[in-house]
């Protein structure tokens, strides 16, 4: 006989987008419309949360921008959170200091990505020094992960 | 009797590098020569074009560069363009203002990275807004992508 | 008979991170300690060894940061030798020039990623233009890879 | 509430130089840059330049340069302005402004200061 | 540097009626979709006071009788209905790039 079908399993995987109704950290994201992902990883409060042990690719981009340029130093950070651990563990991160010319418009992105080893119930979440300077625009602003 | 010999398929992948010959938009890619890859993969005017729907990996790196910087804004763009929807999707973007002191030489990059669903004969394009400000060494500025 | 049960193979994986006693180039990175990954690839003097020839995804972020800005010209590469070759190949590659105020203290990081086909026994490293202005934090400054 | 606060008028004589101070209050001095504007009977409003509160470095208006230093003290939440050089045409009201980076204009304006240059 | 004319440079208006103040810059202030025009208002004796923000934002705290309008070259201030303390000088200034720029005003008179 012939070996069964093979279950084809759904792919872990989350794009989620800017969200400009962030009031505070971690950033919120929208984890429903445009061009969102969310399957097999589940989406609470700011977080992704892990529901399968195992390798992922984890990556974030957040733009920043100002009217009149004062060089605040600004930090972009991705950071894990388990009930097991009584820390945050930042997993990436990307600071910038003085980045543009002073009283001017300006604008930059910080972009992170790498491979982690999580573990069911992990909490992924993003975090951001200068709120006030982030552009949530889908494009521009975002925060995913996919299963290996 | 044994089940037949798995069909290893093709992985769908693509790395496309800088071509100086680009006069217009969107960016035009090296296809050919030096370290391309393209597999289970169309390439058209510029443009990867997908045939087959699914969870992709895409991303592209710019290098802009000029002798005397006027901090013109730089924009890079990913986007993507479909017969059967008449606009086109950005799907990252990154964008730069007064990122150089006046004058002097620079250089900057640009790296944009995300996953996405997408569908059978769309197109991908990278776009930026100072074609005379790259450079399009094969290090430098690339586009790619690889299915899930 | 049924099929034999599928050998589940190790993932070919590594995410190594900033080693601040690095005195020359190429970079060393921590392969034991942290969110160090290392499975299926072999770590060898700055290098990550190839020991099956196929896809990669590979990466590497450098935070450069320095007390008083001179604007020195900064360069992060990711580079193949292979004993086969004669000579380095810069697969990736970031430079940046003007990039903060002189005199003051400044921050920049620079992300590099993408898709290569690889060989058994190729060596990968990462060089940077400017030693003394890297930071070696973990979650700013690191180099990985998975097979596809 | 959010304040900023001028020193008050100069009569100086031509030549000499006069260094006016704006502090803030009420907000985190060092999130906001501070602007500097002229206002004479001739030119309305001038721009004169810029300082980043944070890392203490300016940008002049062209104009300006030469004639104008702005420098910050960040401990005592306190830009200061120094023109150099005085003659009649400086003869100005001179005010601070304050502009969110994350706004598209100086939101809060010092009461400002008188300087009349005079032998 | 971008040159902001204003005009007309005084005008006169009845307690009630609409006042109508326009700025024209010698190239455009718009960028990304935004346009970087702002209003102010300045009483004797006074600072300027931001009124609008980028063309047509009224900031907090000022009266919805103030609106804004335009995009490029071309802006507009109204003030409808104009009351009493609606008195003095009405600034255009623009936060496109550097040197900002103000118009000459316009000092409004109510009949």
């Known amino acids: 006989p012939s070996p069964p079908p093979e279950k084809k399993e759904l792919r872990k995987v989350a794009h989620l987008t800017g969200k400009s109704n962030s009031r505070s950290m971690p950033l919120e994201w929208e984890d429903t419309y445009g061009i969102v992902l969310l399957s097999g990883v589940k989406y609470k409060k700011g977080g992704l949360v892990i529901n399968e042990t195992g390798l992922y690719f984890v990556y974030s981009k957040v733009y920043f921008r100002g009217q009149s340029c004062n060089n605040l130093p600004l930090s972009h950070k991705v950071y894990m959170r388990n009930s097991k651990y009584p820390q945050d563990l930042v997993m990436m991160e990307g600071k910038m200091m003085s980045y543009c010319t002073t009283g001017q418009m300006w604008a930059r992105s910080s972009y992170l990505g790498a491979v982690f080893n999580l573990t069911s119930a992990d909490h992924l979440y993003v975090n951001v020094s200068e709120l006030s300077l982030v552009n949530f625009e889908e494009s521009q602003t975002f925060f995913g992960l996919y299963k290996l | 009797p044994s089940p037949p010999p798995e069909k290893k398929e093709l992985r769908k992948v693509a790395h496309l590098t800088g071509k100086s010959n680009s006069r217009s938009m969107p960016l035009e890619w090296e296809d050919t020569y030096g370290i391309v890859l393209l597999s289970g993969v169309k390439y058209k005017k510029g443009g990867l074009v997908i045939n087959e729907t699914g969870l992709y990996f895409v991303y592209s790196k710019v290098y802009f560069r000029g002798q005397s910087c006027n901090n013109l804004p730089l924009s890079h763009k990913v986007y993507m363009r479909n017969s059967k929807y008449p606009q086109d999707l950005v799907m990252m973007e990154g964008k730069m203002m007064s990122y150089c002191t006046t004058g002097q030489m620079w250089a900057r990059s640009s790296y944009l990275g995300a996953v996405f669903n997408l569908t059978s004969a769309d197109h991908l394009y990278v776009n930026v807004s100072e074609l005379s400000l790259v450079n399009f060494e094969e290090s430098q500025t690339f586009f790619g992508l690889y299915k899930l | 008979p049924s099929p034999p049960p599928e050998k589940k193979e190790l993932r070919k994986v590594a995410h190594l991170t900033g080693k601040s006693n690095s005195r020359s180039m190429p970079l060393e990175w921590e392969d034991t300690y942290g969110i160090v990954l290392l499975s299926g690839v072999k770590y060898k003097k700055g290098g990550l060894v190839i020991n099956e020839t196929g896809l990669y995804f590979v990466y590497s972020k450098v935070y450069f940061r320095g007390q008083s800005c001179n604007n020195l010209p900064l360069s992060h590469k990711v580079y193949m030798r292979n004993s086969k070759y004669p000579q380095d190949l810069v697969m990736m590659e970031g430079k940046m020039m003007s990039y903060c105020t002189t005199g003051q203290m400044w921050a920049r990081s620079s992300y590099l990623g993408a898709v290569f086909n690889l060989t058994s026994a190729d060596h990968l490293y990462v060089n940077v233009s400017e030693l003394s202005l890297v930071n070696f934090e973990e979650s700013q400054t690191f180099f990985g890879l998975y097979k596809l | 509430q959010i304040q900023l606060l001028q020193s008050g008028a100069e009569l100086v004589r031509p030549g000499v130089s006069v260094k006016i101070s704006c502090k803030g209050s009420?907000?985190?001095?060092?999130?906001?840059?501070m602007h500097w504007v002229k206002q004479s009977h001739a030119k309305s409003l001038e721009w004169i330049g810029v300082i980043s509160t944070y890392q203490g470095d300016a940008n002049y208006n062209q104009k300006f340069k030469g004639k104008a230093t702005m420098t910050v003290d960040k401990s005592s939440s306190t830009a200061y302005m120094e023109l150099a050089r005085l003659t009649s045409e400086d003869s100005a009201i001179y005010y601070c402004?304050?502009?969110?980076?994350?706004?598209?204009?100086?939101?809060?304006w010092g009461q400002g200061t008188s300087v009349t240059v005079s032998s | 540097e971008i040159v902001l004319t204003q005009s007309p440079a005084s005008l006169a208006v009845s307690l009630g009626q609409r006042a109508t103040i326009s700025c024209k810059a010698s190239q455009s202030v718009d960028y990304d979709g935004d346009s970087y025009m702002n209003w102010y208002q300045q009483k004797p004796g006074q600072p300027p006071k931001l009124l609008i923000y980028?063309?047509?934002n009224l900031e907090s705290g000022i009266p919805a009788r103030f609106s804004g309008s335009g995009s490029g070259t071309d802006f507009t201030l109204n003030i409808h209905p104009v009351e009493e303390e609606d008195a003095a000088t009405y600034y255009c200034q623009h936060s496109r790039e550097l040197p900002y720029t103000f118009g000459g005003g316009t000092k409004l008179e109510i009949k």
């Open positions: 402004a304050r502009f969110p980076d994350w706004d598209y204009a100086m939101d809060y």
């Open positions: 980028a063309a047509s």
């Open positions: 009420g907000y985190t001095f060092t999130d906001y840059a």
